[in-house]
Interface confidence: medium
């Protein structure tokens, strides 16, 4: 038994041109959460259990509203860690699916909307009991960043959590520095061992006699901060010319950038430059491949020709997505009634009403004139599943709060003036003209001329 | 955690007028519908109603129409279920229900129940 | 309105042994919208099953829902001495929302 978490780093626009706009809008705030699902990576996945190594979902973020004209930031994530534990042995390659979701929250009928926001997915390698694995993984314009690992919960031990070690009572035959373990009297369990002076804070080893290094940090024993100058000490006052007395490891020393990735200094760090299938700051990750087994129940995997989709998945009937993930869209059932909207959030359909109904296929009609008075005298008039307030001469607005201007459709003919009045409005007309809004003009001789017929 | 707290249990006379309060805690209200569900003695549960509390839209069942008023205050999170010219068959346990937080799921969330007695 | 009926009316069990109460609609109920209740003496119904087969939060999965069209079913896989109440279907696929008259489930 054990557990499987994921941290999420950050979420927001990749890199490049085409950089989405912020998922949450001034008028719409919303907040994220994240799903994971887990599937053991070397069996063929049926369709019937998704998620057969199980699933977790975060809490919800922070909301968020977009500030207009901004560009979209990484968006405020929800705190902790996902944790999905499993039962049995964990199985060393794995599959995973994370999905980041959007609630919106604004005063929409029903409550909140969710909708996918981005999908990635993935297989991996992973021994339980290692450190973090750092991940970058994109979904269209979108770009996630994340750890995990796979830990075992006591008193399992191993790789694969199958095995029980507890501190026994009786003295210990295994040698200094191993743990004597259940159920084999004899068998005692080595700690993995580093190589020799690897940094504990900021090195890790997967295999015995290794040394690597976490983000920010290079050098054989990691013991060198990636921004450290290339100056160990500068030269004495009696150099005339400036650079470094004795050269300190620079920040490529060594060569940081793994799978040929060539590196090359930076005022403050260094960057890689990775071949065609690698990323990541060190271009330790891997763009998914049709060796990842990205394709899920049943999918069949192609090799993409476009660098940047380097598979392509042909999905089983029933299915459908990049990654074949989805099931064939049940909205095409069309089960939202009343003109509402569908969304098929995998689980579940959800429909979004038009205004005036209500429920989960919008089959209320509701009665939009119950609760809600017009104001100032104004009566309430439905129709089409919404209300309006058919209001008192001189009130506005969708309720009849406010106050109308008569006069501002400049109702007055000929320069006449406007007055608004408790009854409605009165023209006073310039000189030489008549009538309520001043449209006919005086005769010299006292009648008005009108034109005649 | 979310709570749905409903008035006490009132005594009227036929033809006289009800009205039960239900106070929500624990959610954002104005994001869940709340529907009126009612339960006469030993029988079984009727549903009256639904309001919008973002809105306070409303649509009743038909044999209520015209004798229920459902009204919602949003700045005590409360929403109220008026039934007029009460009669004997409208003695009842008078609930309200939110509606679940889960896309395609129905009341999860209950009033404690309100006993209305219809007498002369 | 769609008019729900259950069946049996009381159904005496005892412990341990397997319920399986039925549900009926006069006209067809979209599966994702059909829910079963339990009520106990003197509270509020308790939603077990939401969507025909999909359990509500902290219900025990010794409950399970099936059925689809105009015939549903709430089966109890072995009955604990917690599980004796009236259940309630439920259909919120179309306006009015109705409920089935209840099944009262009772030790033998």
């Known amino acids: 038994a054990g557990v499987f978490e994921l941290q999420i780093h950050s979420f927001g626009p990749g890199p490049g041109p085409g950089a989405p706009r912020s998922p949450c809008s001034a008028r719409l705030p919303c907040r994220l959460f994240f799903r994971v699902c887990l599937k053991p990576g070397l069996s063929e996945e049926a369709a019937e259990s998704p998620c057969a190594l199980g699933a977790a979902l975060s809490a919800r973020g922070p909301v968020y509203t977009e500030q207009p004209g901004a560009p979209a930031p990484d968006l405020p994530l929800p705190d902790g860690l996902l944790q999905v534990p499993f039962r049995d042995a964990w199985p060393g390659t794995f599959s995973f699916i994370i999905e980041t979701w959007r609630e919106e929250l604004g005063d929409q009928i029903g409550g909140p909307a969710w909708s996918l926001l981005a999908r990635v997915a993935g297989r991996r390698r992973l021994a339980a009991g290692g450190p973090w694995a750092r991940d970058i993984q994109r979904a269209g314009a979108w770009e996630l960043r994340f750890s995990y690992r796979a830990r075992c919960e006591p008193p399992a031990v191993g790789t694969a959590c199958t095995r029980l070690c507890r501190p026994r009572s009786a003295p210990s035959r295994c040698g200094p520095g191993l743990r004597p373990c259940a159920p084999l009297e004899d068998e005692c369990e080595a700690p993995l061992v580093c190589r020799a002076g690897c940094s504990p804070e900021h090195g890790f080893c997967e295999q015995p006699g290794e040394c690597r290094c976490l983000e920010g940090w290079t050098g054989p024993l990691c013991t060198v901060p990636v921004s450290t100058s290339s100056c160990l000490s500068p030269r004495g006052p009696s150099s005339a010319t400036t650079g470094c007395l004795v050269p300190g490891p620079g920040p490529c020393d060594g060569n940081p950038c793994a799978n040929g990735g060539s590196c090359s200094e930076t005022p403050r760090s260094f960057e890689c430059t990775c071949p065609r299938g690698f990323y990541g700051l060190r271009c330790e990750v891997s763009g998914v491949t049709c060796a990842d087994g990205p394709c899920f129940n049943g999918g069949l995997c192609v090799g993409g020709a476009d660098p940047d989709s380097a598979y392509i998945c042909h999905c089983p009937p029933g299915f459908q997505g990049s990654n074949c993930e989805k099931r064939v869209d049940r909205c095409s059932l069309q089960p939202c009634r009343n003109g509402g909207l569908c969304l098929d959030l995998g689980h579940a359909l959800r429909c979004r009403c038009r205004a005036g109904f209500a429920g989960p296929r919008c089959e209320h009609d509701l009665d939009d004139c119950a609760g809600r008075a017009c104001a100032n005298g104004g009566t309430c008039v439905e129709g089409g599943g919404a209300h309006r307030c058919s209001c008192a001469l001189g009130f506005g607005g969708r309720d009849c709060r406010e106050r109308a201007d008569p006069c501002a459709a400049r109702p007055c003919a000929h320069g006449g003036r406007c007055y608004a009045h408790f009854s409605g409005l009165v023209c006073a007309c310039a000189p030489g003209y008549m009538g309520a809004r001043c449209e006919f003009p005086v005769h010299p001789d006292g009648a008005s001329a009108l034109p005649a017929a | 955690q979310v709570q749905l707290v409903q008035s006490g249990a009132e005594v009227k006379k036929p033809g006289a007028s009800v009205k039960v309060s239900c106070k929500a805690s624990?959610?954002?209200?104005?994001?869940?519908?709340m529907h009126w569900v009612r339960q006469a003695p030993g029988q079984g549960l009727e549903w009256m109603g639904i309001?919008?509390?973002?809105?306070?839209?409303?649509s009743y069942a038909q044999k209520f129409q015209g004798r229920v008023t459902m009204t919602r205050d949003t700045s005590t999170s409360t929403v109220y279920m008026e039934l007029s010219s009460l009669r004997s068959e409208d003695t009842a346990v008078y609930y309200c229900?939110?509606?679940?937080?889960?896309?395609?799921?129905?009341?999860?969330?209950w009033g404690q129940g309100t006993l209305v007695t219809v007498s002369s | 309105e769609i008019v729900l009926t259950q069946s049996p009316g009381t159904l005496s069990l005892s412990p341990g042994e397997r319920a399986t109460l039925s549900c009926r609609a006069s006209?067809?109920?979209?599966?994702?919208?059909l829910a079963w209740y339990q009520q106990k003496p003197g509270q509020a119904p308790r939603l077990l099953i939401y969507?025909?087969?999909s359990w509500a939060t902290g219900i025990p999965d010794r409950f399970s829902g099936s059925g689809s069209g105009t015939d549903f079913t709430l089966t109890i896989s072995r009955l604990e001495p917690e599980d004796f109440a009236v259940y309630y279907c439920?259909?919120?696929?179309?306006?009015?929302?109705?409920f089935g008259q209840g099944t009262k489930l009772e030790i033998k």
């Open positions: 969507g025909a087969s």
């Open positions: 309001i919008n509390p973002s809105g306070g839209s409303t």
């Open positions: 624990g959610y954002t209200f104005t994001s869940y519908y």
């Open positions: 439920q259909q919120y696929d179309s306006s009015p929302y109705t």
């Open positions: 229900a939110r509606v679940a937080d889960i896309v395609g799921a129905t009341f999860d969330y």
């Open positions: 006209q067809s109920v979209s599966s994702s919208y």
